[in-house]
Interface confidence: low
């Protein structure tokens, strides 16, 4: 999947099965995921976990599940609140569209999470202050979270090379260039860009990732994983200037 | 992961030996600190293991259930703007406790805010 | 939603052996104990043991080891439970039951129970 | 023979209160903090109602309440429903063994 870090660096990663998203003293967010088709080194998320510790008079430990088609607006427990405890309304979960989309806000940390079902896949989206986000006892076991260090160089794909030589492809079939060989209905370039253009008419990262996504899948459900993914930017990112992130050399992990 | 093992470890300590609201807390507080660095050994092993995690928050839990010292090594660093939870009174009569914004502003001004995102693929 | 299924009921003949299942579904298997309990005719609960599913871990009632033999495979989230050289007196209702994590010991998510019936 | 004694019946009419008692020893009871309670109605799997002597799972009504003194646990069932009427066993983690009370059946009159 595609990752935004807590320092706005702007990684593909091809991390499979299950990881730390989130690993700190009050949140513990893990992400499951599994190749985009046979073969392909691209993944995405079919399944995230979500625990709320135990906080004060705040909450109760709460897990919340999404899996794919399962995006409940629910904790596993079936509640919907941080449980019977003083300040239990602190910690909600709101379904915005029914098994589409969710918003949990745990006010008692400062924190909102977006999960959403887009195709197939599930995307994540957090606000976290920073006093949150290095809540952290362990550096070395617990800070080696995706959001905070980013993915291992070893597991990451360098989509926005891939783009460019898919660019000077023109309108042929990218199949050898993409990470997935064997991709059925895989686009023409100037037909992924005309759909992402639609959804995404700023040529950031995201817009390039669309790109990519459909180069790759042949899924047009990603354009709207690209285009969600930049909305809950906008709604969750405090720094309206850094909306967009736009090409760089690729950052090194941590 | 030996995260079982801990628990285990510590419901023997516990089992035979103390009372929550006894004058054992010393002892209880010494068995959870004991519990503790169980954990810590083997957090290397566990990262991604949600019975870890549940493991560590319990024992915030305990620690300040038992009033144990939280100055060892021990104990689980908490956000400077939310009062400790020893403080019971302040903790059962203000809702602020649980709204951090509310009590951020009280320490100084805007939190600062990050985003992280995942998508695609 | 967090579930146990257990497998159907047996009828054994004293002295065989019985394996029962219990497939969990709905959370992450590895980050529970799962405890077995039985209940006999009538009677009250009686608890065998528990298994961490994570490292294979066991915890066997006293009463109970070296007929006992509590397994897990992760790779189904299933926990097994067999029971050998069975006597009339093991004829019961037997449950799988999840232990909650963390520091505390209880069992917050149980099986619908598999009745084992010894008979000659 | 349980080593967790629990009276084998107690009864009340709705909305009265019902205490059912759980007494041990000071290494199964009185020391122990792994004191949990569970329901069960005729033919179903056992529930659990209580853990940690007082602590409430999410989904069970506040009417159910826990406490301990000495080496005996109790569960009050305050405001008594009819559908309040089953099997209530006591739980406790002692050291190598786990230890169920005997059961107490609980009567809505």
């Known amino acids: 999947p595609h990752l935004r870090t807590f320092t706005d660096r702007f990684q593909t990663c091809k991390v499979q099965g299950a990881w730390p998203l989130i690993d700190n003293n009050y949140l513990n967010v893990q992400v499951t995921n599994t190749p985009v088709l046979p073969g392909s080194a691209a993944t995405a998320t079919s399944k995230l976990t979500i625990i709320f510790k135990n906080f004060q008079e705040c909450v109760d430990q709460k897990v919340y599940q999404a899996e794919m088609d399962e995006l409940p607006a629910a904790f596993v427990d079936g509640s919907k609140n941080g449980g019977d405890k003083h300040g239990a309304n602190s910690l909600k979960i709101t379904e915005k569209v029914s098994g589409q989309h969710v918003e949990i806000q745990a006010k008692y940390i400062g924190t909102t999470i977006v999960v959403r079902q887009v195709g197939r896949y599930l995307t994540f989206a957090v606000r976290m202050p920073e006093e949150v986000v290095n809540a952290v006892e362990d550096w070395d076991s617990q800070g080696l979270y995706l959001c905070l260090r980013g993915c291992p160089l070893n597991q990451q794909i360098d989509f926005q090379a891939f783009h460019t030589n898919a660019e000077g492809t023109g309108a042929r079939r990218l199949a050898a260039a993409s990470p997935a060989p064997t991709a059925p209905e895989t686009f023409p370039y100037e037909t992924a860009v005309a759909k992402c253009k639609e959804k995404l008419p700023v040529e950031d990262l995201y817009y390039q990732a669309c790109v990519f996504d459909l180069l790759t899948t042949g899924d047009v459900n990603f354009t709207l994983a690209a285009y969600y993914a930049l909305e809950d930017v906008k709604m969750l990112h405090s720094n309206k200037d850094k909306l967009h992130l736009y090409e760089r050399t690729r950052d090194l992990p941590g | 992961c030996k995260i079982l093992k801990c628990n285990s470890e510590f419901w023997s300590a516990t089992s035979g030996s103390h009372a929550p609201a006894s004058d054992d807390t010393p002892e209880f507080c010494a068995a959870l600190r004991s519990y503790a660095l169980c954990t810590r050994r083997t957090a290397r092993t566990c990262r991604g293991d949600l019975a870890y995690h549940s493991a560590v928050h319990g024992i915030e839990d305990l620690m300040s259930q038992h009033n144990c010292s939280k100055d060892g090594p021990t104990s689980q660093p908490r956000l400077r703007t939310l009062p400790p939870a020893g403080d019971s009174q302040e903790r059962s009569d203000s809702p602020e406790i649980c709204h951090y914004e509310k009590s951020f502003h009280k320490h100084s001004a805007t939190p600062n805010y990050t985003h992280c995102g995942l998508f695609g693929d | 939603e967090v579930q146990l299924v257990q497998s159907g009921a047996e009828v054994k003949k004293p002295g065989a052996s019985v394996k029962v299942s219990c497939k969990a579904s709905?959370?992450?298997?590895?980050?529970?104990?799962i405890s077995w309990v039985r209940q006999a005719p009538g009677q009250g609960l009686d608890w065998m043991g528990w298994?961490?599913?994570?490292?294979?871990?066991?915890n066997y009632a006293q009463k109970l080891q070296g007929r006992v033999t509590m397994t897990t495979d992760t790779s189904t989230s299933t926990a097994y439970m067999e029971l050998s050289s069975l006597r009339s007196e093991d004829t019961a209702v037997y449950y799988c039951?999840?232990?909650?994590?963390?520091?505390?010991?209880?069992?917050?998510?149980w099986g619908q129970g598999t009745l084992v019936t010894v008979s000659s | 023979q349980s080593a967790l004694t629990q009276p084998r019946s107690v009864s009340g009419s709705p909305g009265q209160s019902v205490t059912i008692s759980c007494t041990g020893t000071?290494?199964?009871?009185?020391?122990?903090?792994?004191v949990s309670w569970y329901q069960q109605h005729p033919g179903k799997a056992p529930k659990l109602m209580l853990y940690?002597?007082?602590k409430r799972p999410s989904g069970v009504p506040d009417r159910f309440s826990g406490s301990k003194s000495g080496n005996t646990a109790s569960l009050t069932i305050s405001g008594l429903q009819a559908e309040d009427e089953a099997d209530y066993y006591c739980?406790?983690?002692?050291?190598?063994?786990?230890?169920f009370g005997g059961g107490t059946k609980v009567t809505v009159l």
């Open positions: 000071s290494s199964s009871v009185g020391d122990s903090i792994y």
């Open positions: 940690d002597v007082t």
């Open positions: 298994i961490s599913p994570y490292s294979g871990n066991t």
């Open positions: 739980l406790s983690y002692a050291g190598t063994d786990t230890l």
């Open positions: 039951a999840r232990v909650g994590s963390g520091p505390y010991y209880y069992m917050d998510v």
């Open positions: 709905g959370y992450t298997f590895t980050s529970h104990g």
